[in-house]
């Protein structure tokens, strides 16, 4: 039902990589424009977006509020230009999101590889810990922070002179491997959240391999 | 439920090949990682080797690097181990394992094997 | 590639005894290594992960600890369904490798 020129928005679904959360809808707008609303389970609704011509609404700063809690969104569609018109009941037409639970759903960003360095026989990698738009204490907080022992980093590493790929992981954002001498390697990491059934892996880093500029090398 | 089912086992002749297939259910394969796990008659469990299909990248163990490859197809929810240039000691039983990609990297789900007997 | 020496290759055990199982890693593994259950024509299950984690549905007579490079496998109490064969596993570098497993029979 509804006004006879308002369509109900459709196709709710959320777009989150390390807590940057962007809920899109369908359709294009022909003649109409949408409010976004969003609650916790037990909260109170509060509005986003008011009568936006756009199909989408970035709710990061509500989500981040609490990011283990489970949100729902809702999007109210309205005839442009007469935004008080409402459905037949009385109501201006929505429609409900999927529920989205942050901690465990968010897709994890592609890693950095921040650093090498090697050292004899041994070679030490770091990667960049991701700034989230998460706080605590008006600090914005690292994905380690957010996640804690929750997150762990596997490292692939090969020598530049073959294809096999070895693996490593680490619960910190550091890695210490045993290297041959004199052959050069090459490195990608990718973020795990092993306790989740979905969205588990982050796309793989960039490669990064030693001679180039990143890495250092210390002969001792 | 989450599953695997290993299949394609049998007999082959000195120098054959053969296809296992290890097909999962219950979860998407490029989520895990998949490692194949072989056991001889009356034998200790030999790791094969693995692949992470999310990117393809593998990694095998000495006895049977360059005669096997993994591989896997995520439109099938499908790894494969292809074995050739066959050995009378490459007969036992072969199992894929799911691999959590924890900090210990255990093997939490195994399929229930497939024989395969090499033997003129 | 690091070795997992497990002792003894075989035991034998009455129901109700406590029984030990060890591995030794070569070189230090950390925490990541986990062991296996296996029964004539079956699959290995798992046990314990990261040394000594009960993974679930494990009855809780077994445990798993860990010395430095030495880990230890633990059934406190022997059941009729636990004569089996278990086997350690490291992880901690790539190739993963097993012990030789230990036959668990019966006495």
């Known amino acids: 039902s509804g006004t006879t020129n308002t369509v109900a928005a459709y196709n709710l679904t959320w777009k989150s990589t390390n807590f940057k959360t962007i809920l899109e809808w369908e359709p294009k707008p022909v003649n109409q424009v949408y409010t976004v609303q969003i609650s916790t389970k037990s909260g109170d609704w509060k509005s986003k977006c008011f009568y936006t011509t756009d199909t989408e609404c970035d709710l990061t700063d509500e989500i981040v509020k609490d990011v283990k809690q489970t949100y729902l969104a809702r999007v109210f569609s309205y005839p442009a230009g007469n935004v008080e018109s409402t459905g037949s009941a009385g109501e201006p037409l929505y429609e409900n999101s999927p529920e989205f639970t942050p901690y465990l759903e968010t897709n994890l960003g592609q890693p950095t590889i921040q650093s090498f360095e090697q050292v004899g026989t041994k070679v030490n990698v770091t990667v960049e810990d991701e700034r989230t738009l998460v706080r605590r204490n008006n600090t914005f907080l690292s994905l380690r922070d957010v996640f804690g022992k929750d997150l762990i980093y596997t490292l692939y590493y090969w020598k530049s002179s073959s294809s096999g790929k070895k693996t490593a992981k680490t619960n910190t954002n550091e890695f210490l491997i045993d290297v041959d001498k004199g052959e050069n390697y090459c490195f990608s990491v990718q973020a795990v959240i092993p306790s989740r059934t979905v969205n588990r892996k982050s796309t793989d880093s960039p490669v990064e391999c030693m001679g180039q500029e990143k890495g250092e090398f210390r002969e001792i | 439920e989450v599953q695997l089912v290993e299949s394609g086992g049998g007999l082959v002749q000195p120098g054959g090949s053969l296809r296992l297939s290890c097909a999962a259910s219950g979860f998407t394969i490029p989520d895990y990682i998949i490692h194949w796990v072989r056991q001889a008659p009356g034998k200790g469990l030999e790791w094969v080797g693995y692949i992470d299909p999310s990117n393809g990248y593998t990694y095998y163990a000495d006895s049977v690097k360059g005669r096997f490859t993994i591989s896997a197809d995520t439109s099938k929810n499908t790894a494969y181990l292809q074995m050739n240039s066959l050995r009378a000691e490459d007969t036992a039983v072969y199992y894929c394992?799911?691999?959590?990609?924890?900090?210990?990297?255990?093997?939490?789900?195994w399929g229930q094997g497939t024989l395969v007997t090499v033997s003129s | 590639d690091i070795q997992m020496t497990q002792s003894p290759s075989s035991l034998s055990a009455s129901v109700g005894d406590r029984v030990t199982i060890t591995c030794r890693a070569s070189?230090?593994?950390?925490?990541?290594v986990a062991w296996y259950q296996q029964k004539p024509g079956k699959a290995p299950k798992l046990l314990i992960y990261s040394a000594s984690f009960l993974y679930s549905g494990v009855p809780s007579r077994f445990s798993g600890s860990r010395s430095g490079t030495d880990f230890t496998l633990t059934i406190s109490s022997l059941q009729p369904e636990d004569f089996a064969t278990y086997y350690c596993?490291?992880?901690?570098?790539?190739?993963?490798?097993f012990g030789q497993g230990t036959k668990v029979e019966i006495k």
């Open positions: 596993q490291q992880h901690y570098t790539t190739p993963p490798t």
């Open positions: 070189q230090d593994v950390n925490t990541a």
């Open positions: 394992a799911r691999d959590i990609q924890s900090v210990s990297g255990e093997f939490d789900y």
